[in-house]
Structures are given as C-alpha cells and as structure tokens.
C-alpha cells in the first residue's frame, strides 16, 4: 500500500561496466520523486540521489568501497512537494533491486589495443590496462589491479590478406606472437573472466592493423 498519488518503482536494473555502476528503474515520475538507498547484506542503508526526478542513480561511489560485497538497493517513491508523506504502513512506498555483486557481475568494458611492435617474425601486442573507479590508498586501480589473474585476454589475429583467424591467450596484458615475414596482420582483443558464470566476456576491441599508425615496425 502507499499514498494515493505515488506508484512504486519497478524494473530496477543494475547497469555496470568496469565498476561504473548505475541503478535504473521505471516509471518516469509524474507528480512524484525518488530517493535511493543502498546497503551491503550486513550493513546499514545509505541514502543517495535524494528526491530526484531522474530514473537512474549513480551508485559507483558506494560499490567501489568493496567490490566483492553483495549490494542491495531500494527506490522510495514520494509525492512531489510532499516528501514527508508516507504510506498507510507508516513508510514511503519502495521497491527492492536484485542483489548485485560488482566483482562477479560488472560488465567488462571494451578493451583497447595500446600498441603493437614487430621485431623480426615476432609481434608484441599490448592491451591498455584501463583505469577503474575502484580506489586503494588514494589511487585508482586498473582492471588488472582489481581482477588479478581472474582476468585474461584473448587475442584474435589474422593476415590482412586472409580471413583465417588465430588466437592466443594471456594472464597479463601482453602477447608475443609469431608472424610470417613480410605479411601485415590485424588484431583484436577480448577481456575474459573464465571463472564467472555471467558477463564472462567483453565485446571485442576495435581492430588494429599493421601498417597503420598505432604500431611500430622494426626489422631485425
């Protein structure tokens, strides 16, 4: 139950990539406003996005405090201009979100190939170690800093002149692959967390090809 002029939020959905985490919900408010609360299973509720007419709330600052915790959020509905009003049960109407564990569920953002360098018949491909909003000791941690060896990268590479793809994997952000002399190759990488049950893979990075500016060629 609730007041006659408010409706409960619904379709509460977590949208999270590389720990940038936003809670979204419906409906667009008509004569009502929302406040969001978030907590861990064992923690106290903390209010965010007070009396907003938005249907989203950025909860990144809260979840990055401990990305391995499981979080629950709830969205309260209040009549516009009368936020003290409560439902018949003595509290405002609210709806709970699904549980969310950032470490296990945040989407892996599209990776970027930082550089590639050819030395003879070997090419070293380096994946950019993207910065996250997770902080430790006042510094922002990279994706590798957070996930450690849980994160691997898969490299797809192929001759520019053909479509047959080869793959390599690495537990670091670097690959060292064998190539045919005199051939140009194209590369794309994907981030993967093999131990996950959901959101295991990122989208593929933009394709980078030899003979373009990003790489460096050295014949030895």
């Amino acid at each position: 139950s609730g007041t006659t002029n408010t409706v409960a939020a619904y379709n509460l959905t977590w949208k999270s990539t590389n720990f940038k985490t936003i809670l979204e919900w419906e409906p667009k408010p008509v004569n009502q406003v929302y406040t969001v609360q978030i907590s861990t299973k064992s923690g106290d509720w903390k209010s965010k996005c007070f009396y907003t007419t938005d249907t989203e709330c950025d909860l990144t600052d809260e979840i990055v405090k401990d990305v391995k915790q499981t979080y629950l959020a709830r969205v309260f509905s209040y009549p516009a201009g009368n936020v003290e009003s409560t439902g018949s049960a003595g509290e405002p109407l609210y709806e709970n979100s699904p549980e969310f564990t950032p470490y296990l569920e945040t989407n892996l953002g599209q990776p970027t190939i930082q550089s590639f360098e050819q030395v003879g018949t070997k090419v070293n491909v380096t994946v950019e170690d993207e910065r996250t909003l997770v902080r430790r000791n006042n510094t922002f941690l990279s994706l590798r800093d957070v996930f450690g060896k849980d994160l691997i990268y898969t490299l797809y590479y192929w001759k520019s002149s053909s479509s047959g793809k080869k793959t390599a994997k690495t537990n670091t952000n670097e690959f060292l692959i064998d190539v045919d002399k005199g051939e140009n190759y194209c590369f794309s990488v994907q981030a993967v967390i093999p131990s996950r049950t959901v959101n295991r893979k990122s989208t593929d990075s933009p394709v980078e090809c030899m003979g373009q500016e990003k790489g460096e060629f050295r014949e030895i």
Epitope: V146, K149, T170, N171, T172
Partner: antibody
Framework: QVQLQESGPGLVKPSQTLSLTCTVS?????????WSWIRQHPGKGLEWIGE???????RYNPSLKSRVTISVDTSKNQFSLKLSSVTAADTAVYYC??????????????????WGKGTTVTVSS | EIVLTQSPGTLSLSPGERATLSCRAS???????LAWYQQKPGQAPRLLIY???SRATGIPDRFSGSGSGTDFTLTISRLEPEDFAVYYC?????????FGGGTKVEIK
C-alpha cells in the same frame, strides 16, 4: 636476484591465529608478480593457500577461505598470512613464493619460480 | 577442484636410467597452466617445467615435459645423482591451484 624469507612464531596454540610474514629482497613486490603462500604437512604433499597482487587483489583456496587473510605492505616489501582458529591439522611447513610471468604459446602465464626456504609451524598447547 | 594423480608413487632406478613420471588430471587442464617441480629433503620445491613442456631457467635438457588435456608426463632422460628427489605436478588454471601427490624417484 629475488629472495624470499618467511618469519613468524614456530609454535601456535590451538584456536589462536597463525601469523607469518614473507620479506621480499632483491626486487620490488610491486613489479607485476603475484605472491603466494603454500604449505606442506609433515611427510605429505603441497597445498596452495592463496595469493595476492601488490594492489591487494587476492585469491584463496576455498577450503581455507573462511580462515585465511593474505595482505601486502608495499612500503616494507612484505606480504603476510593470517590463519585463524588453528588446530593440530594446521601443523606444517609454510612456504612463500613468487608467481612470475613466463612466455608460453603466444601469451604469458604465472608460475611459482622463487620460493622461500620454508618455516615450520607447530600447533600445540 | 582439479585433482592431480601422480604415478607411480615411488620409482626405483639407477643413475643413467630413464625416468618417466605420469600426472593425470580429473578434468582437462590447458597446457599453459601445467608445471612440474622438484623437491629435495629439507628444501623448497624448485620449478622445472612450465607450460607442460618448457624448461625453466637453468634446468638441464635431460628434463622434458609433454602431454595435454588430462595426461602429462615428465621425463628425465638419464638420471644423475642429484635428480633423486620428489617430483610434483601442479595446475594453476583453476582455483584452487592443486598439486599432485608426488612421485619419489629413489636410487635402486
């Protein structure tokens, strides 16, 4: 050349917390390697306890996870193991080790290539 | 948990002989994640082989590794006196990392 040295009490009472420290010399603990703890029960095989990255990212053996904490102190070039609620079954030689990346098949994978000498911990009243 | 079973438990051989040690995994292990270690009494283990077949720095070429999937082998082509020790296989692909129970290579 990197060297590792375990230190800590050799005798711990049942139900107490075992605390060991591994000091890294000849290299930086922040240089992109992982740091592990492994133990070996008397006359038995090896058991991996867990690992840590300089950033604090950890992975633990699920069989010990509820009792284990591994932490890192980059300013002292050390990492530590705490094992709570110990019993006689935790009596073992405890090793610290470095996990360094090795090239294989187009990528790099981590292996425990440098080990400390080990320290014997006995749990007894 | 991936269980690694090593056989035989003990191998009694003479110097100069060939030693073949087996490691069988309870489920498939990528070669990228398989290692072999040597341990002598009172010492820490020493990395011999990584990636199932690549020798670690300073390891003599009489040591070789092979295999894929669930079956891996460490071969010592000609045993030297210093090779008598316990050998462990290890997988580092799935948490918890696990070791085999070990094969003791002893002097016959």
């Amino acid at each position: 050349q990197v060297q590792l040295q375990e230190s800590g009490p050799g005798l711990v009472k049942p139900s107490q917390t075992l605390s060991l420290t591994c000091t890294v010399s000849g290299g930086s603990i922040s240089s992109g390697q992982y740091w592990s703890w492994i133990r070996q029960h008397p006359g038995k095989g090896l058991e991996w306890i867990g690992e840590i990255y300089y950033s604090g990212s950890t992975r633990y053996n699920p069989s010990l996870k509820s009792r284990v904490t591994i932490s890192v102190d980059t300013s002292k070039n050390q990492f530590s193991l705490k094992l709570s609620s110990v019993t006689a079954a935790d009596t073992a030689v405890y090793y610290c080790a470095r996990d360094a990346p090795y090239y294989y098949g187009g990528g790099y994978y981590y292996y425990m290539d440098v080990w400390g000498k080990g320290t014997t911990v006995t749990v007894s009243s | 948990e991936i269980v690694l079973t090593q056989s035989p438990g003990t191998l009694s051989l003479s110097p100069g002989e060939r030693a073949t040690l087996s490691c069988r995994a309870s489920q498939s292990v990528s070669s990228s994640y398989l290692a072999w270690y040597q341990q002598k009494p009172g010492q820490a283990p020493r990395l011999l082989i990584y990636g199932a077949s690549s020798r670690a720095t300073g390891i003599p070429d009489r040591f070789s590794g092979s295999g894929s999937g669930t079956d891996f082998t460490l071969t010592i082509s000609r045993l030297e006196p210093e090779d008598f020790a316990v050998y462990y296989c290890q997988q580092v692909g799935v948490v918890p990392y696990t070791f085999g129970g070990g094969t003791k290579v002893e002097i016959k």
